[in-house]
C-alpha cells in the first residue's frame, strides 16, 4: 500500500510539544491495510477494496478520506467515532458503495466535517437524523458546508410501495434528513442531481438558509409550484437543467426575482408553449436571472417545437392545441 510516509519533520504546536515531554517528533501513524495514506497530503484513500465497514484504525491526521467503490451497505451510528477523534477530517467521500441505510448519528464525532459525498448509493433508509445527530427539535449545528447526494435514489424495485408512492416516500425521506433539527443551517452547497424527483417537497429547502448552490439537474421535476425559494436569500446558482418542467408560474418567478444574486439554469426542459407560458416568456425577456435563456426552446405543441422562448410573442401562445397525454397535468 503506497505512500504511507514517515514524518521526520512533523511537530505539534509548541505547547503540546512541551507537554508531551518528548524530544522526538511523534512517530508516523499506521495506515489501514486496505488503504493508501499520505500524511503530507493528510489524505487516506481506501478505494475499490470491497470493504464492508469503515476501517477502525484511521490515522488521526486525516483530512481527506476516500472510501469509494466498496461494499458497505449500512453506515451505523458513530461509524467514524474514534479515540482520539478524527478532529481534522474535513472531506469524506463515500460515493459508489452499496449503502442502503445511513443511521442516525452516523457522522457524529466529526467536528470539522465540511464536505460529505454520499452519491451513487441506493439509499432506502436515510435516517431523518443522519446529519443532525440527535432528535432534538433544534440540534447543535452540523459543520457541514457541502452535501453531495447525487443519484442516491434506489432502483424502482427497492422503493417502498411501488413506483409513484415510493418516489413520494423517497423525496420525503430526503427532505426530512435535510430539515431535521435545523442542523444544516450552515450548508452552502447541496447537490441532488439524478434522483428521479417528481416534485420538490414544500419544506425541502425551508431549513437551509445559507444555501448558495443548489443542483437539481437531471431529475423529473414537472412543476415548482409547491417549492419555495423565498428563504434562500444567499442563493447564487440554481441548476434545473434536464428536468420535465413545462412552465414556470408567476409565484416562482417572483420569488427568484426577489433573490439578489441568483442565477437559474433551465436548459433542456420540455417547455409547453401555450397560453400559460405568456408570463414566463415576458419575464425571460426582461430578466438577467437566466444565463442560458437564449437556448430555451419549446417542446410542445408540435407546431411550436424548437422555437426559442425569447422569440415568442403573445400571439404565438394559444391554448387550442391538444397536448400528449403524458404532459397533461392531473
Amino acid at each position: 500500500s503506497a505512500p504511507s510516509s514517515s514524518v521526520p519533520s512533523s511537530s505539534t504546536s509548541p505547547a503540546a510539544f512541551l507537554a508531551s515531554g518528548s524530544a522526538q517528533p511523534p512517530p508516523a501513524e499506521r495506515c489501514p491495510a486496505a488503504c493508501e495514506c499520505s500524511e503530507a497530503a493528510r489524505t487516506v484513500k481506501c478505494v475499490n477494496r470491497n470493504l464492508l465497514e469503515v476501517p477502525a484504525d484511521l490515522p488521526p491526521y486525516v483530512r481527506n478520506l476516500f472510501l469509494t467503490g466498496n461494499q458497505m451497505t449500512v453506515l451505523p451510528a458513530g461509524a467514524f467515532a474514534r479515540q482520539p477523534p478524527l478532529a481534522d477530517l474535513e472531506a469524506l467521500n463515500l460515493s459508489g458503495n452499496h449503502l442502503k441505510e445511513v443511521c442516525a448519528g452516523a457522522f457524529e464525532h466529526l467536528p470539522g466535517l465540511r464536505r460529505l459525498d454520499l452519491s451513487h448509493n441506493p439509499l432506502t433508509n436515510l435516517s431523518a437524523f443522519a446529519f443532525a445527530g440527535s432528535n432534538a427539535s433544534v440540534s447543535a449545528p452540523s459543520p457541514l458546508e457541502e452535501l453531495i447526494l447525487n443519484h442516491i435514489v434506489p432502483p424502482e424495485d427497492q422503493r417502498q410501495n411501488g413506483s409513484f408512492e415510493g418516489m413520494v416516500a423517497f423525496e420525503g425521506m430526503v427532505a426530512a434528513a435535510l430539515r431535521s433539527g435545523l442542523a444544516l443551517r450552515g450548508l452552502t452547497r447541496l447537490e441532488l442531481a439524478s434522483n428521479h424527483f417528481l416534485f420538490l417537497p414544500r419544506d425541502l429547502l425551508a431549513q437551509l438558509p445559507s444555501l448558495r448552490y443548489l443542483d437539481l439537474r437531471n431529475n423529473s421535476l414537472v412543476s415548482l409550484t409547491y417549492a419555495s425559494f423565498r428563504n434562500l436569500t444567499h442563493l447564487e446558482s440554481l441548476h434545473l437543467e434536464d428536468n420535465a418542467l413545462k412552465v414556470l408560474h408567476n409565484s416562482t418567478l417572483a420569488e427568484w426575482h426577489g433573490l439578489a444574486h441568483v442565477k437559474v439554469f433551465l436548459d433542456n426542459n420540455p417547455w409547453v408553449c401555450d397560453c400559460y407560458m405568456a408570463d414566463m416568456v415576458a419575464w425571460l425577456k426582461e430578466t438577467e436571472v437566466v444565463p442560458d435563456k437564449a437556448r430555451l426552446t419549446c417542446a410542445f405543441p408540435e407546431k411550436m417545437r424548437n422555437r426559442g422562448l425569447l422569440d415568442l410573442n403573445s400571439s404565438d401562445l394559444d391554448c387550442d392545441a391538444v397536448l400528449p397525454q403524458s404532459l397533461q397535468t392531473s
Epitope: A2, S9, S13, S38, A40, A91, R115
Partner: antibody
Framework: QVQLQESGPRLVKPSETLSLTCTVS????????WSWIRQPPGKGLEWIGE???????NYNPSLKSRVSISVETSKNHFSLNLSSVTAADTAVYYC????????????????WGQGTLVTVSS | EIVLTQSPATLSLSPGERATLSCRAS??????LAWYQQKPGQAPRLLIY???NRATGIPARFSGSGSGTDFTLTISSLEPEDFAVYYC?????????FGQGTKVEIK
C-alpha cells in the same frame, strides 16, 4: 479569492535572523495551511515549512534547526523567522496557501504571494 | 526525501508545436504530484494537480498523466505565453519537494 502579500526587510546581515510576514486578504487565516517556499536567484524552488490552521508546524529537515513559522490570527497574517543566515539564504521568499480552493482538502500551493527578494550581505 | 528529476532541462520549440515534459520520482508518489508554471519575475502558478487534474482557469491544451514514479506534462500546441519554466512537485511524503525545472524556450 484569497490573496497573499509578503513583507519584511530586503537586506539582512550574515548571522542575523531573517523575518518575513505574509498578510492574507480575501479569506480567513483560520482555515487552510500556510507555507513558505524560497527560490535562490536562477535556481529551483525549496519548501521551507508550513503551519496549519490548528497550529501544527512542519519544517524541511534541511532547515529545521533554524526555522520557525507562526500565525497571528487576529491580524490575518503568518510569519517566517530564519536564524543564523548566510549568503546561501539569499533568495526570493514566497508565501503560499495549500487548501480550500476545491471542496476536498487541497494540499497544493495555490495561490502564491508575488515573492520578495531577501539578500544576505554585510 | 523524495527526489524529483525533470527532463529535459531545456526544450526548444516553436509556437504550435507539442511539448512533452517528464518528471521522475525517486520512489512512488502515487498520484500526489503537481505541475507549476513560472514566468520571469512572477510567482509559480498551479497548472495540474493530483497528476492529471487541470487547476481552475487552466486551458485544455495543458494535460498531465502518470502515476507512481513517472509523470508527464503535455502542452498540445504551444502558445506564445506558454514559454516559461515548469516545475513538478510531490506531496506524498515529507518534505514536499520540487523538481529542478524544465525551461520551454522559443526555438
Amino acid at each position: 479569492q484569497v490573496q497573499l502579500q509578503e513583507s519584511g526587510p530586503r537586506l539582512v546581515k550574515p548571522s542575523e535572523t531573517l523575518s518575513l510576514t505574509c498578510t492574507v486578504s480575501g479569506g480567513s487565516i483560520s482555515s487552510n495551511d500556510w507555507s513558505w517556499i524560497r527560490q535562490p536567484p536562477g535556481k529551483g524552488l525549496e519548501w521551507i515549512g508550513e503551519i496549519s490552521y490548528s497550529g501544527i508546524t512542519n519544517y524541511n529537515p534541511s532547515l529545521k534547526s533554524r526555522v520557525s513559522i507562526s500565525v497571528e490570527t487576529s491580524k490575518n497574517h503568518f510569519s517566517l523567522n530564519l536564524s543564523s543566515v548566510t549568503a546561501a539564504d539569499t533568495a526570493v521568499y514566497y508565501c503560499a496557501t495549500a487548501g480550500g480552493s476545491s471542496g476536498w482538502y487541497d494540499y497544493w500551493f495555490d495561490p502564491w504571494g508575488q515573492g520578495t527578494l531577501v539578500t544576505v550581505s554585510s | 526525501e523524495i527526489v524529483l528529476t525533470q527532463s529535459p532541462a531545456t526544450l526548444s520549440l516553436s509556437p504550435g508545436e507539442r511539448a512533452t515534459l517528464s518528471c521522475r520520482a525517486s520512489q512512488s508518489v502515487s498520484s500526489y504530484l503537481a505541475w507549476y508554471q513560472q514566468k520571469p519575475g512572477q510567482a509559480p502558478r498551479l497548472l495540474i494537480y493530483d497528476a492529471s487534474n487541470r487547476a481552475t482557469g487552466i486551458p485544455a491544451r495543458f494535460s498531465g498523466s502518470g502515476s507512481g514514479t513517472d509523470f508527464t506534462l503535455t502542452i498540445s500546441s504551444l502558445e506564445p505565453e506558454d514559454f516559461a519554466v515548469y516545475y513538478c512537485q510531490q506531496r506524498s511524503n515529507w518534505p514536499p519537494t520540487f523538481g529542478q525545472g524544465t525551461k520551454v524556450e522559443i526555438k
